[in-house]
């Protein structure tokens, strides 16, 4: 039988807005990944920032509802925004426990689906918060 969906929870310092209220944090101790049990969906998400071939996690947690993409078993990120020149935000949604822990692969930033220069921008050093 299914359990309530459990996702990895992480929010990088400086990230604006929190998704902590979308679930209940489990007490996992210090050495394990933080885990959140989703309150309103059976869907996890992840956001990574790719800069000069280096990916850094920005946010991981629960989505606020089940949307297209949530049926995916794995985290397959797609490019969503350019928060600053030379960096691209990739996001994924997936619907299995801890599926947002890491991604299967990142497509190249210039691949189809990347928003053009009209995408969300952020000043250098400023983080961006995206409504998923």
């Amino acid at each position: 039988p299914p359990n309530r969906r459990t996702c990895v929870f992480f929010e990088a310092p400086g990230v604006r807005g929190s998704t902590k209220t979308l679930g209940e944090l489990l007490d996992t101790g210090t050495e394990l990944p933080r885990a959140i049990r989703c309150l309103y969906s059976r869907c996890c998400f992840g956001i990574w920032n790719l800069t000069q071939d280096r990916a850094q996690v920005e946010m991981q947690g629960c989505r606020d509802s089940d949307e297209p993409g949530c049926e995916s078993l794995h985290c397959d990120p797609s490019p969503r925004a350019h928060p600053s020149p030379g960096s691209t935000l990739f996001t994924c949604s997936c619907g299995t426990d801890f599926c947002n822990a890491n991604y299967s692969h990142l497509p190249p930033p210039g691949s189809p689906g990347t928003p053009g220069s009209q995408g969300p921008q952020a000043a250098p050093g400023e983080s961006i918060w995206m409504a998923l």
Epitope: P1, P2, N3, R4, R5, T6, L26, T28, L32, P33, A35, C38, L39, Y40, S41, R42, D66, D97, F98, A101
Partner: antibody, heavy 113, light 112 residues
Framework: QVQLVQSGAEVKKPGASVKVSCKAS????????VSWVRQAPGQGLEWMGE????????NFNEKFKGRVTMTTDTSTSTAYMELRSLRSDDTAVYYC??????WGQGTLVTVSS | DVVMTQSPLSLPVTLGQPASISCRSS???????????LEWYLQRPGQSPRLLIY???NRFSGVPDRFIGSGSGTDFTLKISRVEAEDVGVYYC?????????FGAGTKLEIK
């Protein structure tokens, strides 16, 4: 087919610890939570907690916090439940289950001085 | 903790006749994701519990279709359309919506 095979019966003294093992086969061990449930003699079932073998994240019944440790060894597809500071009312059959759908045969733990 | 109240505690049934077990929870078991984490188990004498129903009404694989789960919110029912000899044992309802997960006290089904 899915199978969960538990370790044999144990007799312990009050204050001691017990570690029950649960060896899984027939499925991908890291893809399912392992639940632990106990049943005192002639009584009903009591949920103790669960662990996700892929990363070791566990979720406990507060009643057992501080006394129970759940671990897994993914190389042998084995889950473990250790209960410390045993009391006579911990005498029970301890069951492991694959996310509550397939259950082990149970391990009787008797706590007696 | 969420209290699961089963009735009756003992259920004598004639072979071939229907049987019904009620389970009431002290809080709604519908979770924020829209799913109701309510399950039914049968523990035959001397055996481990066996999953019958999950998500209120979904039969687990291999469970005969004479077992029917229904209900919502705080009121749930397990019906057996025609009781067979192998159905003897203790039936437990269980909720996984709230922590800690909790079982009902059990309903002992026996043949008259």
């Amino acid at each position: 087919q899915v199978q969960l095979v538990q370790s044999g019966a144990e007799v312990k003294k009050p204050g001691a610890s017990v570690k029950v093992s649960c060896k899984a086969s027939g499925y991908t061990f890291t893809d399912y939570w392992v639940s632990w449930v106990r049943q005192a003699p002639g009584q009903g079932l009591e949920w103790m907690g669960e662990i996700y073998p892929k990363n070791g994240v566990s979720n406990f019944n507060e009643k057992f916090k501080g006394r129970v440790t759940m671990t897994t060894d993914t190389s042998t597809s084995t889950a473990y439940m250790e209960l410390r500071s045993l009391r006579s009312d911990d005498t029970a059959v301890y069951y492991c289950a694959r996310q509550r759908d397939y259950w082990g045969q149970g391990t009787l733990v008797t706590v007696s001085s | 903790d969420v209290v699961m109240t089963q009735s009756p505690l003992s259920l004598p049934v004639t072979l071939g006749q229907p049987a019904s077990i009620s389970c009431r929870s002290s809080q709604s078991l519908e979770y924020g994701d829209g799913y109701t984490y309510l399950e039914w188990y049968l523990q035959r004498p001397g055996q481990s519990p066996r999953l019958l129903i999950y998500g209120v009404s979904n039969r687990f694989s291999g469970v005969p279709d004479r077992f029917i789960g229904s209900g919502s919110g705080t009121d749930f029912t397990l019906k057996i359309s025609r009781v067979e000899a192998e159905d003897v044992g203790v039936y437990y309802c269980f909720q996984a919506t709230h922590d800690p997960n909790t079982f009902g006290a059990g309903t002992k089904l026996e043949i008259k």
